[in-house]
Amino acid sequence: ATKLTEEKYELKEGQTLDVKCDYTLEKFASSQKAWQIIRDGEMPKTLACTERPSKNSHPVQVGRIILEDYHDHGLLRVRMVNLQVEDSGLYQCVIYQPPKEPHMLFDRIRLVVTKGFSGTPGSNENSTQNVYKIPPTTTKALCPLYTSPRTVTQAPPKSTADVSTPDSEINLTNVTDIIRVPVFN
């Protein structure tokens, strides 16, 4: 069995976590991807998902979480903006490949958010409206569910994370839930 590893990131309230999860390009480019939180003894909880199928460089925003899937580079970019202390926890990127269980992209991210002023670019959440004007939709599921089997093999890629920099700046206020319309059986 593969040993699960973690990378620890310590950030201040108001900062942005910026995670890049690598995946095998030819296998998973269009697969739906998600950002999950893992808590001891519990089923992982999906917090946000890409479209189904995943669209190239198309930002999906759910609350303070923004997902972007860069097919050309084989990476899923996850940003959690305006971090709060309660965001602290263990996270992972996964690829949905129903009916198989989600495939985890290594490493897991151990996020520790502490109180304290941050002057990090992108940490001021009071200035502008949403960067991404995605029309809100009403949907049954947080993540659209596949209705037919898809078989894929997998390799364990790696994830990296860093604090936001000016070129990844995003300012959000009055964040609303932006989710997609699913297909159901």
Epitope: T46, L47, E86, P99, K140, Y146
Partner: antibody
């Protein structure tokens, strides 16, 4: 239209094992991303989640029942099953199977009609 | 485990009048990161299984009449039936799915006055 139907003995003796099966019709248990769960309701009382299973066999159990519960799945028969060991009168309840949106959501959007299981000698 | 407490235990309302059911969780069921409250409401009529009415605290399940609405955030939630109909006589349950195990409230019985 997807339907769930519970089946199994309506009477179980104390200290024995309660065994129930849920048959899924109108769709394949293994062709979507749902978990499948068991919930029970003692007569005149509230609802208690017992546990849930994915078609691959991954399970999550209620810690209060974990030592006595086994949930399994048989994809060839489109069924999943519940076994509850060492039962007592407190396990008398209507047992429901339900579709569980699992790690995607966590609520139960489709339920079987339920089957009453009485624990008595 | 998260404890879900419903009030009142029972409620008698005249036809066409508003019915309000409260649900309180022992800890927040809101993930602030995605702004989602992991709370659902169910309706259970005698001899029937529960039926999903509301999820994400305020989103109506497909086919549920719009007289049913859910509101609230964090630890305090409300199910409102804006104009009670005879077919709404049932027991209503809230359920949190924020953490394992998912837990249900004790139920509120709604009757016609």
């Amino acid at each position: 239209q997807l339907q769930l139907q519970e089946s199994g003995p309506g009477l179980v003796k104390p200290s024995e094992t309660l065994s129930l099966t849920c048959t899924v019709s109108g769709g394949s248990i293994s062709s979507s991303s749902y978990y499948w769960g068991w919930i029970r309701q003692p007569p005149g009382k509230g609802l208690e989640w017992i546990g849930s299973i994915y078609y691959s066999g991954s399970t999550y159990y209620n810690p209060s029942l974990k030592s006595r519960v086994t949930i399994s799945v048989d994809t060839s028969k489109n069924q999943f099953s519940l076994k509850l060991s060492s039962v007592t009168a407190a396990d008398t309840a209507v047992y429901y199977c339900a579709r569980d949106l699992g790690q995607y959501e966590g609520y139960f959007d489709l339920w079987g009609r339920g089957t009453l299981v009485t624990v008595s000698s | 485990d998260i404890v879900m407490t419903q009030s009142p235990d029972s409620l008698a309302v005249s036809l066409g009048e508003r019915a309000t059911i409260n649900c309180k969780s022992s800890q927040s069921v809101l993930f602030s990161s995605n702004n989602k409250n992991y709370l659902a409401w169910y309706q259970q009529k005698p001899g029937q299984p529960p039926k999903l009415l509301i999820y994400w605290a305020s989103t109506r399940e497909s086919g549920v009449p719009d007289r049913f609405s859910g509101s609230g955030s964090g630890t305090d939630f409300t199910l409102t039936i804006s104009s009670l109909q005879a077919e709404d006589v049932a027991v209503y349950y809230c359920q949190q799915y924020f953490s394992t195990p998912p837990t249900f409230g004790g139920g509120t019985k709604v009757e016609i006055k």
